[in-house]
């Protein structure tokens, strides 16, 4: 008999290499037999994990699986670190492994801006 | 020295369709995404689409069905395409060039905008 | 959506008077913009991510806020700030703005 019992299927160690400035989605693999799970996402700061607050997301729902998604409109250098999702499934905290984001800034060293070039170039 | 200009047809009939064209100079189109704000005196301003460097797009989901955002890296341009225009289609029409810095993201440098106006 | 609401919608003030306007949104925020537009002009970005003057904005400018609740902050009217000032967020697709407030000057 299969279990019923909430699912996250992020494997151990994964990765991803993205680059800021453009968009990507973060998807958490969320297996669950009859009620949907309330599933969040939190970054690591140290040992502790901070919950996402105002951030985007959504689900995508497949035939055998669902995806609980983290939306980044667009990738900013802040994004780099690890994240984990975690599921409240009948007054149970489960918990995904973690998945790292490197984030790599397109913007590069000729083209980033001096101090002075950053504030007046939000004049039009 | 960062630039953006619109070129709009002004005046397009009911039914039609609209397509607007964004030429930018002073920065790469394949590093910083370009959006498409208008700008109505019924619904203020309007969030339409972007183009992400990378070349992915991202609509207002309530025009979306109507909207076709697409780009040209080497001519520096983009393109805005909406089908089915209406009389509230009525607005100046402004392409937007997006930057972020290390913790937020922000709409900088504004094109001097094109007026459309729905007519027959 | 999130829905940003904008008050006052016109608001008249004498130079040297402080301004504060506001801006809630109707579900919470990372950060918030502002834009200062005049007619036929397009807009211009004036504070971004809540705090932050854009260049040649004068220091009696200010903005402040979390969650749902900012505000931006003139310390002393002068006639040269007379403009529809928007706010925006960037925290959740559709990315809106408010419904202006009009600051005009006595």
């Known amino acids: 008999k299969e279990s019923c019992d909430v699912q996250l299927y992020i494997k151990r160690q994964s990765e991803h290499s993205i680059l800021a400035g453009d968009p990507f989605e973060l998807e958490c693999p969320v297996k669950y037999c009859a009620n949907r799970p309330h599933v969040t996402w939190c970054k690591l700061n140290g040992t502790t994990c901070v919950k996402l607050e105002d951030r985007q997301t959504s689900w995508k729902e497949e035939k055998n699986i669902s995806f609980f998604i983290l939306h980044f409109e667009p990738v900013l250098p802040n994004d780099n670190g690890s994240y984990r999702c975690s599921a409240n499934f009948q007054r149970n905290l489960i918990e995904s492994h973690s998945t790292t984001l490197y984030v790599t800034d397109v913007k590069s060293a000729s083209e980033r801006p001096s101090k002075d070039e950053m504030a007046s170039r939000f004049w039009a | 020295q960062v630039q953006l200009k619109e070129s709009g047809p002004g005046l397009v009939a009911p039914s039609q369709s609209l397509s607007i064209t964004c030429t930018v100079s002073?920065?790469?189109?394949?590093?910083?995404?370009v959006h498409w704000v208008r700008q109505s005196p019924g619904k203020g301003l309007e969030w339409l689409g972007v183009m992400w460097p990378g070349g992915r797009t991202s609509y207002n989901p309530a025009p979306m069905s109507r909207l076709s955002i697409s780009k040209d890296n080497s001519k520096s341009q983009v393109f805005l395409k909406m089908n089915s225009l209406q009389t509230d289609d009525t607005a100046m029409y402004y392409c937007?060039?997006?930057?972020?810095?290390?913790?937020?993201?922000?709409?900088?440098?504004w094109g001097q905008g094109t007026s459309v106006t729905v007519s027959s | 959506q999130i829905v940003l609401s904008q008050s006052p919608a016109i608001l008249s003030a004498s130079p040297g008077e402080k301004v504060t306007m506001t801006c809630r949104a109707s579900s919470s925020v990372s950060y918030m913009h502002w834009y200062q537009q005049k007619p036929g002009s397009s807009p211009k970005p004036w504070i971004y991510a809540t705090s932050n003057l854009a260049s040649g904005v004068p220091a009696r400018f200010s903005g402040s806020g979390s969650g749902t609740s900012y505000s931006l902050t003139i310390s002393r009217m002068e006639a040269e700030d007379a403009a529809t000032y928007y706010c925006?967020?960037?925290?959740?697709?559709?990315?809106?703005f408010g419904g202006g407030t009009k600051l005009e000057i006595k």
């Open positions: 002073g920065f790469s189109l394949t590093t910083y995404g």
């Open positions: 937007v060039r997006g930057d972020y810095e290390y913790d937020y993201y922000a709409m900088d440098y």
């Open positions: 925006h967020q960037w925290s959740s697709n559709p990315y809106t």
